[in-house]
């Protein structure tokens, strides 16, 4: 229903705390370089204005759209052009073009230092002095680094952060309590960021129809007892909510997400038997819990999929006269029977079914033609199953770090033109799939592995799109979203690549490496590994193992030496010479 004042409506629905958090996220995602203090000033102004509209919906400017109000605020920032260059040109446009322009200027890889967690004591002091400001900084820092982070979910992580600090800051050993708990929140949030970026990519590149198909498959897996009409309603709502968040309509998105949670909890009987525990929680936790809900039990008496989609005489009639609905019911029926498949695989199967009907329904004897379609799914199913098997075996053999290195070598060979930091980031994330998925029960491995890999590869595509350097990457990234992972898996060594010149400085290290945290040390070594592969793309596994083993020993030896600097200065050139020789 239409409201006189959109901003008053959202303020009343969301409450002041969530309203302010969402406005802060919105501004931080649009203007990623602005300091917290500048954004918080704007947030306060917007909040005060919203309160005047709650008091009187007819007050001046209260009838303006939220995009207009937010855009006007952003465009009034002094020195906008100095700090943001081209983005300032957006301010010459009218809505909705102005908002579209802001969206196009979101930077997936902003030039910001990595978010450093303060020392435990310092963190607790500033949290206890001003919890609101502390959590505001958290929202700001995450949102500016992840301009597509799902805003209501980020509020949930801020709430988790708050809980951890409240609990741990009273402990005697604050660091021991905080570190593992905050690491867990950080890990979950980073995965959430790449997953949501994938959803926004899907929406941006392929539109609502493609996203809705994804949602139908996902919901059907989770809620196999729900009717198709119920699944369609949920998928339509989820599509609308994600479109809003991806489009910067964060207040509407969060409000609609809360509404959807309310609807699901009021209609548990027709959705799933697993919802009750979620429905007893407060709003942010309730929505998050519902988003992560375990699959309901599959109905025992489901007929064979063939009865409806192969054996019926009027398959082609349904396909011709109600194409989208028919393919939707196919996706629903197949997905509810296969919680053990990835959504990407289910969408590939639906696409294969569609292509088969497109071909067969134009032929003389359609049933004879499409009669074997289900058997033709077999290779499509086997391919990701084999991928999971071989990669999990490799992970179990090498451990996470070793597995990341194997992935790094593989991907550097596939796309050596891609920048080393991007390759290292991608390989580290791809390599985490082992820890995340390979320890799960068999039935959960495939969906975990493939849907996670798809999200990480989407991040690679988003970064590559900004500065395209590899034709092979461009080709895989330009195709359909569900074909990306198989496309990347199928890439081999890029034969067109001219190896990089061997530069001694790339492999020159200093004593500062000794004091780095383990993670940073690993990144340094992995950077060197990628550079080695760029120098010798056809180096054998044994050659690379030798060189990297030698390198690890060198670092270890010099970090234990009395005169570290001298050790690095004298042993370094020897290492470089030995490496060149080993790779000759």
């Amino acid at each position: 229903e239409a409201h006189k004042s959109e901003i008053a409506h959202r303020f009343k629905d969301l409450g002041e705390q969530h309203f302010k958090g969402l406005v802060l996220i919105a501004f931080s995602q649009y203007l990623q370089k602005c300091p917290y203090e500048e954004h918080i000033k704007l947030v306060q102004e917007v909040t005060d204005f919203a309160k005047t509209c709650v008091a009187d919906e007819n007050a001046e400017n209260c009838d303006k759209s939220i995009h207009t109000l937010f855009g006007d605020k952003l465009c009034a920032i002094p020195k906008l052009r100095d700090n943001y260059g081209e983005l300032a040109d957006c301010c010459a446009k009218q809505e909705p073009e102005r908002n579209e322009c802001f969206l196009q200027h979101k930077d997936d890889n902003p030039n910001l230092p990595p978010f450093q967690r303060p020392e435990a004591e310092a963190m607790c002091t500033s949290f206890q002095e001003n919890p609101t400001s502390f959590l505001g900084h958290y929202l700001h820092e995450v949102a500016r680094r992840h301009p597509y982070f799902y805003a209501p979910e980020l509020l949930y992580y801020a709430e988790k952060y708050n809980e951890v600090l409240t609990q741990c800051c009273t402990e005697s050993d604050k660091a021991a309590c905080l570190t593992p708990k905050l690491d867990a929140v950080k890990e979950k949030a980073l995965v959430a960021a790449v997953r949501q970026r994938m959803k926004c990519s899907s929406m941006q590149r392929f539109g609502e129809r493609a996203f809705k198909a994804w949602a139908v498959a996902r919901m059907s897996q989770r809620f196999p007892n729900a009717e198709f009409a119920e699944i369609t309603k949920l998928a339509t709502d989820v599509t609308k909510i994600n479109k809003e968040c991806c489009h910067g309509d964060l207040l509407e998105c969060a409000d609609d997400r809360a509404e959807l949670a309310k609807y699901m909890c009021e209609n548990q009987a027709t959705i799933s038997s697993k919802l009750q525990a979620c429905c007893d929680k407060p709003v942010l936790q309730k929505s998050q819990c519902l988003a992560e809900i375990e699959h309901d039990n599959i109905p025992a008496d489901l007929p064979s999929i063939a009865a409806d989609f192969v054996e019926d005489k009027e398959v082609c009639k349904n396909y011709a006269e109600a194409k989208d609905v028919f393919l939707g019911t196919f996706l629903y029926e197949y997905s509810r029977r296969h919680p053990d498949y990835s959504v990407s695989l289910l969408l590939r199967l639906a696409k294969k079914y569609e292509a088969t009907l497109e071909k067969c329904c134009a032929e003389g004897d359609p049933p004879a033609c499409y009669g074997t379609v289900l058997a033709e799914f077999q290779p499509l199913v086997e391919e990701p199953k084999n991928l999971v098997k071989t990669n999990c075996e490799l992970y179990e053999k090498l451990g996470e770090y070793g597995f990341q290195n194997a992935v790094l070598v593989r991907y550097t060979q596939k796309a050596p033109q891609v920048s080393t930091p991007t390759l290292v980031e991608a390989a580290r994330n791809l390599g985490r799939v082992g820890t995340k998925c390979c320890t799960l029960p068999e039935a959960q491995r495939l969906p975990c592995v493939e849907d996670y890999l798809s999200a990480i590869l989407n991040r690679l595509c988003v970064l590559h799109e900004k500065t395209p350097v590899s034709e092979k990457v461009t080709k895989c990234c330009s195709g359909s979203l569900v074909e990306r992972r198989p496309c990347f898996s199928a890439l081999t060594v890029d034969e067109t690549y001219v190896p990089k010149e061997f530069k001694a400085e790339t492999f020159t290290f200093h004593s500062d490496i000794c004091t780095l945290p383990d993670k940073e040390k690993q990144i340094k070594k992995q950077t060197a590994l990628a550079e080695l592969v760029k120098h010798k793309p056809k180096a054998t596994e044994d050659q690379l193992k030798t060189v990297m083993g030698d390198f690890a020993q060198f670092v270890d030896k010099c970090c234990k030496a009395a005169d570290k600097d001298n050790c690095f200065a004298t042993e370094g050139p020897n290492l470089v010479a030995r490496s060149k020789e080993a790779l000759a």
Partner: nanobody, 126 residues
Framework: EVQLLESGGGLVQPGGSLRLSCAAS????????VAWFRQAPGKEREFVAG????????YYADSVKGRFTISRDNSKNTLYLQMNSLRPEDTAVYYC???????????????????WGQGTLVTVSS
């Protein structure tokens, strides 16, 4: 739960007409495809006609094509089967059936339909 209730059956002469109604209720009923089946004494239940839910699509058995017309009025949650040029072999108990939430008739196999009305008898005889 879907509930279905047929009415309109009766005795009619060959060549005559009859209109059957099926009152349907339940969640998402207007988005659910509904079918008419019939069962003659000593025979299997056979599919007669069907109509999509929220989708403008109709289905007919070859034996009734051109003589029977299926329609629905969602404002009244009622399904109709207009039967013209009736023949003695059309004599049977007519049932309406539904697969909840399924917008299309994707199968004519009676066993796949969990919800049935109690049936209405149609007798075509001179």
């Amino acid at each position: 739960e879907v509930q279905l209730l047929e009415s309109g059956g009766g005795l009619v002469q060959p060549g005559g007409s009859l209109r059957l109604s099926c009152a349907a209720s339940g969640r998402y009923i207007d988005e659910t495809a509904v079918a008419w089946f019939r069962q003659a004494p000593g025979k299997e239940r056979e599919f007669v006609a069907g109509i999509g839910g929220g989708v403008d699509i109709t289905y007919y058995a070859d034996s009734v094509k051109g003589r029977f017309t299926i329609s629905r009025d969602n404002s009244k949650n009622t399904l109709y089967l207009q039967m013209n040029s009736l023949r003695p072999e059309d004599t049977a108990v007519y049932y309406c059936a539904a697969r909840p939430g399924q917008p299309l008739i994707t199968s004519k196999v009676a066993d796949l339909y969990p919800y049935w009305g109690q049936g209405t008898l149609v007798t075509v005889s001179s």
